[in-house]
Interface confidence: medium
């Protein structure tokens, strides 16, 4: 069958019909519906929402909608024994205690089951000791403290400001530095934009607002008790001592009112430079301990949270493909929230809901996509991407053989300035072409394309007249599909102006103040940015599922491979003497990249010329495109990170949110000058160059003529 036998409408009309059916008013209505009560993973409320979504997706017209459940390790505060932090005097009396909850926003005073701020998976404990301020608790912050300032964090409680890197990396760094507890806080320098009022009068973080979040270092493992395998009814579970990624020291988050009380008394060393100062009226002294009059006072943490194996529920909807039902295009986003989820995740879930409704409308009119589309509402993303990872582990054999693409759909907005896209290079041309066909929602760009406003506001640093597209890192549900399974992936949302707003994320992230009203009053009153994101996400899914030839351009991979090879070579060339001493050469990598470039170019020429009416040849060419991302997977994974298997991209070892290119080589080179055995360290660099060169060459060969 050709794809047009699947439908009585022309392909171009289909896309227009799909996009025209998406309505801002529906997204608004869905967002309201999804945000009236908390939907914390593992709770009855979130199970009920799963069943509601299942029912509505069926009504919208999907072929089947099933719940997929797993029993995974989650973490909750003790309801009768709250978590808090104290300042204690020399007699052990608590002279100051941090708040036990966030003041609820107007209209939500009587809502039950608002989980108080906590760091999910913190162990229990009541450590007490001197405080050390560690800035953002990044790798480089601890280098500054330990190497330059000679400050020892061993046996200390450290206080770190949120921002810049994933909180789990902060905790890992603190553990490695010997700390016995971690306090995380939101500094106004990072979470209070100048000239904007705090919630409920604006979108800034009030002093009592606190960011929740997990502090795991899972490295892609999913459920900590069942790494590599689904947490199903007959699962073998590790003991808690063998669980993957759990922190070993107590951790707790606070707002900036409470942080002020802790930081104002700090003594010891002055901050090393201005980059260690936030916006509170405190000296930002590093410590250790309090100054003069307060030097006998200590900080004490009281953490009583528990880890519990709990049932979670994904919703999986299927729209069967008419021509290639065994090829899957997946649109997935999570449903669970910390509290109301006004932005994270429900601004994304509402968009997915409207995309499903639009596809369902077309299906009811007799249309089907060429390939199967799977829709997913993931659970327990906030607890470590658990729902998506367990489902992918359960279905890995199907996914690695049939997975064409995964499009992520968490928060649709983190600002209202311009589009932000992170994706595989295979999707660059798809994103460019699609955004040229969509209207920009931005003021001052009426009648202009989304591509034009995006390119103006967020230009590529390398290619004139093109928009910036970033690497995929992690911290969201695409991780297992891209980093573990090698399925081409992408994500899109509306973002802030990174040049003028240097705060981290959006100020109310993971706080109780992330409400429907936050979005409706301050971010997107007309829901026009949500609609644009729905068009981008939905349009990508439509094209991926419906185009006769997959809309992947392998030549764009060649371009970035050269860029990444240049970058990693230039990092290595910081050490010219060692490169010479240990005979370190990048020739094999550059040669493989050159071969990839030539073979990709020839493949693209064949792709223009082949007989598209021959279904066998069409399928063969499409399979070469589909399996190209898969070819970058190393079955052995990265050193000490077996579930990060992509050789070109991995989450940074220093910040899970960020992507690193040629991560194996990068990590081998990182801080190599401090390694005790330089011969061994440079041997590992050479091994990683070998792995990368082999993988690029092997991937290139998958694009060669098959015989």
């Amino acid at each position: 069958k050709s794809s047009n036998e699947a439908t009585n409408i022309t392909p171009k009309h289909n896309m227009k019909a799909f996009l025209d059916e998406l309505k801002a008013e529906n997204i608004k209505k869905f967002l309201y519906n999804f945000t009236q009560i908390p939907h914390l993973a593992g709770t009855e409320q979130n199970f009920q929402l799963a069943k509601q979504i299942q029912s509505q997706w069926k009504e919208f017209g999907l072929d089947s909608v099933e719940l997929a459940h797993y029993d995974v390790l989650l973490s909750y505060p003790n309801k009768t024994h709250p978590n808090y932090i104290s300042i204690i005097n020399e007699d052990g009396n608590e002279i100051f205690n941090t708040s036990l909850f966030e003041p609820p926003p107007p209209g939500y005073e009587n809502v039950s089951d608002i989980v108080p701020p906590f760091s999910a998976f913190s162990p229990q404990g009541m450590p007490e000791g001197d405080l050390v301020y560690v800035n953002y608790a990044r790798t480089e912050d601890f280098f500054k403290l330990e190497r330059d300032m000679k400050i020892n964090c061993s046996g200390k409680i450290v206080i770190a400001r949120y921002g810049k890197v994933f909180r789990g990396n902060k905790v890992k760094n603190a553990q490695l530095a010997g700390a016995k507890g971690v306090i995380l806080y939101s500094d106004p320098a990072d979470y209070f934009a100048p000239g904007v009022k705090s919630y409920p009068d604006g979108w800034n973080l009030p002093g009592g607002g606190v960011q929740r979040g997990n502090i795991l270092n899972l490295n892609g493992a999913g459920d900590p008790l069942t790494p590599g395998y689904p947490a199903n009814e007959y699962a073998y579970r590790r003991g808690i001592a063998e669980a993957v990624g759990l922190p070993s020291i107590p951790v707790h988050p606070i707002g900036y009112y409470d942080a002020q009380k802790l930081l104002e008394k700090m003594g010891g060393s002055a901050p090393p430079d201005s980059s260690w100062r936030g916006s509170l009226k405190v000296p930002y002294n590093v410590g250790p301990g309090f100054t003069g009059n307060f030097s006998t006072q200590k900080v004490k943490m009281h953490i009583h949270s528990t880890n519990e194996v709990t049932r979670i529920y994904n919703v999986i909807g299927t729209l069967r493909g008419a021509v290639e039902p065994d090829r899957y295009v997946i649109l997935g986003g999570h449903r669970d929230s910390w509290v109301f989820g006004g932005i994270d995740p429900q601004s994304g879930a509402a968009v997915v809901h409207e995309i499903v409704r639009s596809f369902g409308t077309l299906k009811k009119e007799g249309w089907r996509p060429r390939r199967t589309i799977l829709f997913a509402s993931w659970d327990a993303e906030e607890f470590g991407l658990l729902g998506s990872t367990e489902w992918a582990e359960e279905n890995s054999r199907l996914l690695q053989e049939r997975g064409v693409a995964y499009i992520n759909a968490d928060s649709s907005i983190e600002g209202n300035y311009t589009l932000r896209v992170d994706c595989t290079p295979l999707m660059y041309s798809l994103v460019h072409n699609l955004t040229k066909e969509l209207k920009s929602p931005d003021e001052g760009f009426e009648g202009k394309s989304l591509y034009e406003s995006w390119t103006k506001k967020s230009p590529s640093p390398e290619f004139s007249g093109m928009p910036r597209i970033s690497k995929l890192g992690s911290g969201n549900d695409f991780e297992v599909f891209f980093q573990r399974l090698g399925i081409a992936s992408g994500r899109a949302r509306y973002t802030k102006n990174w040049e003028t707003n240097k705060f981290s994320g959006y100020p109310l992230y993971h706080s109780v103040y992330e409400t429907y009203e936050l979005v409706e009053k301050f971010y997107d009153p007309m829901f026009k940015y949500h609609l644009t994101v729905a068009q981008v996400r939905g349009g990508m899914v439509f094209e991926l599922a419906n185009s006769i030839v997959l809309p992947f351009d392998c030549r764009d991979y060649a371009v970035v491979l050269r860029k990444y090879a240049d970058k990693i070579y230039s990092i290595s060339m910081k050490h010219p003497q060692e490169m010479k001493t240990y005979s370190v050469s990048f020739d094999s990598l550059f040669s493989a990249v050159k071969n990839f470039t030539e073979i990709a170019s020839k493949f693209s020429e064949r792709l223009q010329d082949f007989d598209k009416s021959n279904p066998i040849v069409l399928r063969m060419m499409n399979d070469q495109l589909m399996f190209l991302e898969r070819a970058f997977i190393d079955p052995l994974g990265l050193p000490d990170r077996p579930f990060y298997r992509h050789v070109i991209y991995a989450p940074s070892s220093h910040n899970k949110y960020a992507g690193e290119s040629f991560p194996g080589i990068y990590d081998a080179l990182f801080d190599i000058e401090s390694k005790v055995d330089p011969s061994k360290a440079w041997g590992e660099v050479k091994r990683q160059i070998y792995v990368a060169a082999f993988t690029v060459q092997a991937a290139a060969e998958t694009l060669s003529e098959v015989a």
Partner: nanobody, 119 residues
Framework: QVQLQESGPGLVKPSQTLSLTCTVS??????????WSWIRQHPGKGLEWIGF???????HYNPSLKSRVIISVDTSKNQFSLKMSSVTAADTAVYYC???????????RGQGTLVTVSS
């Protein structure tokens, strides 16, 4: 916090060479996670990327400007420079230096300096 400041003459005669320097403060130009760019914006137009450099001298240029541009770095002074030869009135623009990386939070740029090409 890292800050970038452009410096150089605001007026250049046609056919001469435009020279600008970017001084980086609050952080080392040797940081391997970043590359250092020159960008320009013609009056009423979008941004045009000129080129970028890694601290050790690995350079990429905009192909349309490659024949006229040299970007260099001086790690000892924490500076990088732009030289553009054979300028014409079409090179009149606000010139920015920028720090970049592969991720969104990496992007910073200076205040910009207006360079007018006129006799």
């Amino acid at each position: 916090q890292v800050q970038l400041q452009e410096s150089g003459p605001g007026l250049v005669k046609p056919s001469q060479t435009l020279s600008l320097t970017c001084t980086v403060s609050g952080g080392s130009i040797s940081n391997s996670g970043y590359y250092w760019s020159w960008i320009r914006q013609h009056p009423g137009k979008g941004l045009e990327w000129i080129g970028f450099i890694y601290y050790n001298g690995s350079i990429h240029y905009n192909p349309s400007l490659k024949s006229r541009v040299i970007i260099s770095v001086d790690t000892s002074k924490n500076q990088f420079s732009l030289k553009m030869s054979s300028v014409t009135a079409a090179d009149t623009a606000v010139y920015y230096c920028a720090r970049d990386g592969d991720d969104y939070g990496d992007y910073l740029r200076g205040q910009g300096t207006l360079v007018t090409v006129s006799s």
